[in-house]
Amino acid sequence: SQVSNLLKQQQTNLTHQKNKLEGQISARQQAEEASQESQNELKEMIETLAWKLNEKSKEQMELHHQNLNLQETLKRVANCSAPCPQDWIWHEENCYLFSTGSFNWEKSQEKCLSLDAKLLKINSTADLDFIQQAISYSSFPFWMGLSRRNPSYPWLWEDGSPLMPHLFRIRGAVSQTYPSGTCAYIQRGAVYAENCILAAFSICQKKANLRAQ
Amino acid sequence: SQVSNLLKQQQTNLTHQKNKLEGQISARQQAEEASQESQNELKEMIETLAWKLNEKSKEQMELHHQNLNLQETLKRVANCSAPCPQDWIWHEENCYLFSTGSFNWEKSQEKCLSLDAKLLKINSTADLDFIQQAISYSSFPFWMGLSRRNPSYPWLWEDGSPLMPHLFRIRGAVSQTYPSGTCAYIQRGAVYAENCILAAFSICQKKANLRAQ
């Protein structure tokens, strides 16, 4: 009975320990569940933050592209090169330069080419009006980009297009043949035919830069 | 002894249960530690993400402001009006218009004013060179914005500033007195004094719009 009592006592201790351990396990299980819950919340939070970060990155990328585009546009526009270079006259779609030196037709043509331009081409009566007005205070002749090899050839502009007869009538040496060809100049609003070898002022013309206007 | 055996068996069971529970507790403890570690990692990750998100927000705000500024600049610049209106010549900081009508000085002055301009003012030898070149193909006189009430008054520009004598020497009727005053014109590169009542061409001048150039 002494052994029995001892065993009973040990059993009681063991039961007590077991209960205690079971209690501990239960508490830990609850804590674990709570921890799991907390971990799930944290993971959710991470997911939300990661999504937000991803969205922000996308937005930022978009803004960055917008910025680059704006800067590019600004670069293009800020140069917004004037319609015409300095010392040229801007009229409608063209830029005009009245030469300050007197040269033969070919040399005048070269001078214009060196300025990325051509000798004057008159496309309309409006063009003619403008030029007549622009040279109204000069009594000098100005070469234009109109010439013919000899009287059996048509009058051609530098770009190869023919002169339209309604624009103006050519005075002067219309029926003459010159070794260097016959060229047209404008003086006091009228157009004359003359030997291309003679020296005169000239009018250069090029397209105005109207992209950014 | 039967009771004793039963108790021993129970004791063995309890010991086994206790050991199992202890094992469980140990495992749970390890899991808990791991969970705690994982939780700490998750918290760290949250902190990092939150910081990154904050940084991104700041960057985005900055980009947004940049964008607004660029758009504002673009608005201003896109209008990028040409330095000078059509038919005017742009040279350095100014626009010049060579009139196509002949009027007295006062009328010429009015014409320029109606175009938001003034009669020509020469500030430097470079200005003079440009004008001399620009009218080199004309033999006509052009009024400029220089006049004097009579020879006992100094030569003044329209803005009231005096003519500096190193710029050019004035030919013509310098010492004359005219009821309408004495005015200066430029012809073939030289400057002359003349009766303001006479008719001549004129040169208008205004500041070029170089804000966006």
């Epitope: - | 006992s152 004598p165 190193h166 030919r171 013509g172 009727a173 004359q176 002359y192």
Partner: antibody
């Protein structure tokens, strides 16, 4: 080259008139004013007035107003200065000069007023 | 009328000396000032105009400066042929007035 050549010396009685000529060459006569400056013996320079050959208009110093007349003949590119009612203190060398400032001068004409 | 006052009225200097003559206007003449040299029995000769511009053909030892009412003619290194009387003149407004002259002599 530009030259201004003046007429020779004159001796006049008080109350008389004198007309000094100045012939220009080497430039466009009508483009530049001709000024007249005088210098009494041992004295400084005194501006009398100017004529614009283009228009023929003249400007005179108040002191000489009514006594001096400046004219020109563009056909011979010559300017004239006439001083009337001469007095002894009009004795001086009379110079013509071109433009302002005066870049070319005539050689001078001595006018002596003596009774 | 604008009064022009020159100083000194006469100056004596040695060959090679730097000589300065001043001219004061009774009011501002904004550089409308000329300097003339006159040798005995000769017509005046333009040296400088617009206060500081040397007339062509005039030796570079002559120079002019100044602004407002005060102007200076300088001969950097006096030469024997510079012996003459020097006059300043304002040509801003009529009557165009001269200074009384400065007689330059060699020591």
């Amino acid at each position: 080259q530009v030259q201004l050549v003046q007429s020779g010396a004159e001796v006049k009685k008080p109350g008389a008139s004198v007309k000094v000529s100045c012939k220009a060459s080497g430039y466009t006569f009508t483009d530049y004013e001709v000024h007249w400056v005088r210098q009494a013996p041992g004295q400084g320079l005194e501006w009398m007035g100017a004529i614009h050959p283009g228009s023929g208009g003249a400007a005179y110093v108040q002191k000489f107003q009514g006594r001096v007349t400046m004219t020109r003949d563009t056909s011979i590119s010559t300017a004239y200065m006439e001083l009337s009612r001469l007095r002894s203190d009009d004795t001086a060398v009379y110079y013509c000069a071109r433009w302002l400032p005066m870049d070319y001068w005539g050689q001078g004409t001595l006018v002596t007023v003596s009774s | 009328d604008i009064q022009m006052t020159q100083s000194p009225s006469s100056v004596s200097a040695s060959v090679g000396d730097r000589v300065t003559i001043t001219c004061r206007a009774s009011q501002g003449i904004t550089n409308w000032l000329a300097w003339y040299q006159q040798k005995p029995g000769k017509a005046p000769k333009l040296l400088i105009y617009a206060a500081s511009i040397l007339e062509s053909g005039v030796p570079s030892r002559f120079s002019g400066s100044g602004s407002g009412t005060d102007y200076t003619l300088t001969i950097s290194s006096l030469q024997p042929e510079d012996i003459a009387t020097y006059y300043c003149q304002q040509y801003l407004i009529t009557p165009y007035t001269f200074g009384q002259g400065t007689k330059l002599e060699i020591k």
